[in-house]
């Protein structure tokens, strides 16, 4: 019988309230032995794919999605996904990224840790969704 | 690398058929497997798609009359109530080149479906 | 919904003339669009994939421009292997649409 794979999380850093043209990373985990991880946004078929995929821990792998200019169209749900051979995990929870004017000093709350245990998740509905080989060095800026 | 479809023939107004996409020389779990259809002298017209474990997108108008489904090997297209409107030819098509489930870059030869009485 | 307008519906030209098609977007889909090529009989094929990359196998005399909402097709050197119905497709939204594809132009070559 094969393995239950479990759910990938999300979260964003520095936080899931991003100044308009600052950077903000998507960080995707899953167990060990992920081949690849994809990021998704809600009700499109566009997708990004990496097969950078690090050891966070001894039971833990991750990947990271940059956008290094977060722009008004950048704002939406997200989610993650994963490829441990021979098998596609479920989707993590959503995650809402959303874009602000840039404005405020360092000590606002915009850099409040954002992730998909957070208040900003949504869960993962079967009825809208997204997949294809990897194609390895892109950005997340890909997925618009 | 291929991908045919089967099941298509001549089914009574108001009938259910299956119809079964087989690919041979790729896994379709890696790929965005959509469904298209064309009526005869008409254009193409998306049905859906599904990917990884069994998630689905479908077309407003496809939306509860049709279902896909898969295998390792197989997808199906599970279409109900059906109608002379529904007649026509249905193609199964691999999504997934440059970042997107839609760009189809492999087609099947396709099943031609008829609805009458 | 999302939805995809293509002109002419028509177009002829002689061999080594060229051809230019239009597909218009009802909102912005970046530069998510494809086109296809289909002959009687067969299936359709892809030509081109994010508006303007040449897709495996594809003569260079197809070319693609355009982003946003606005996108073009253009085959150059008319062949009269040309002779086919071309549609656009956008390739970024599979919720809330109702086809994907535009409503196809037939290039006839004379």
């Known amino acids: 019988q094969e393995e239950d794979l479990p759910r990938p999380s999300i979260s964003a850093e520095p936080g899931t309230v991003i100044p308009l043209g600052s950077h903000v990373t998507f960080v995707c985990r899953g167990p060990v032995g992920v081949q690849t991880f994809r990021l998704e946004r809600d009700s499109r078929s566009t997708y990004n794919d990496t097969e950078d995929v690090s050891q966070a821990s001894p039971s833990e792998s991750e990947a990271r999605f940059r956008i290094d200019s977060v722009r008004e169209g950048n704002a939406g749900l997200y989610r993650c996904i994963y490829y441990k051979p021979p098998k596609w995990s479920e989707q993590s929870d959503y995650l809402e990224l959303l874009v602000k004017e840039s404005s405020g000093g360092p000590d606002s709350p915009d850099t409040e840790p954002g992730s998909s245990a957070g208040p900003t998740q949504r869960p993962s509905d079967n009825s809208h969704n997204e997949h294809a080989p990897a194609s390895q060095g892109l950005k997340a800026e890909h997925l618009y | 690398e291929q991908s045919v479809e089967s099941g298509g023939g001549l089914i009574t107004p108001g009938g259910t058929l299956t119809l079964t996409c087989t690919a041979s020389g790729f896994t379709v779990t890696r790929y965005y497997m959509n469904w298209v259809r064309q009526a005869p002298g008409k254009g193409l017209e998306w049905i859906g798609y599904?990917?990884?474990?069994?998630k689905t997108y479908y077309a407003n108008w496809a939306k509860g009359r049709f279902t896909i489904s898969k295998t390792s090997t197989t997808v199906d297209l599970k279409m109900t109530s059906l109608t002379a409107e529904d007649t026509g030819t249905y193609f199964c098509?691999?999504?997934?080149?440059?970042?997107?489930?839609?760009?189809?870059?492999?087609w099947g030869p396709g099943t031609l479906v008829t609805i009458s009485s | 919904e999302l939805d995809m307008t293509q002109t002419p519906a028509s177009v002829s030209e002689p061999v080594g003339g060229t051809v230019t098609i239009k597909c218009q977007a009802s909102q912005s889909i970046g530069s998510w669009l494809a086109w296809y090529q289909q002959k009687p009989g067969q299936p359709p094929k892809l030509l081109i994939y994010?508006?303007?990359r040449l897709a495996s196998g594809v003569s260079s005399r197809f070319g693609g421009s355009g982003s946003g909402t606005e996108f073009t097709l253009t085959i150059s050197d008319l062949e009269c292997a040309d002779a086919a119905t071309y549609y656009c497709q956008q390739a970024e939204y599979s919720g809330d649409v109702e086809n994907t594809f535009g409503g196809g132009t037939e290039v006839v070559v004379k």
């Open positions: 098509a691999r999504g997934g080149v440059g970042n997107s489930g839609l760009n189809l870059d492999l």
């Open positions: 599904i990917y990884a474990s069994s």
């Open positions: 994010q508006a303007s």
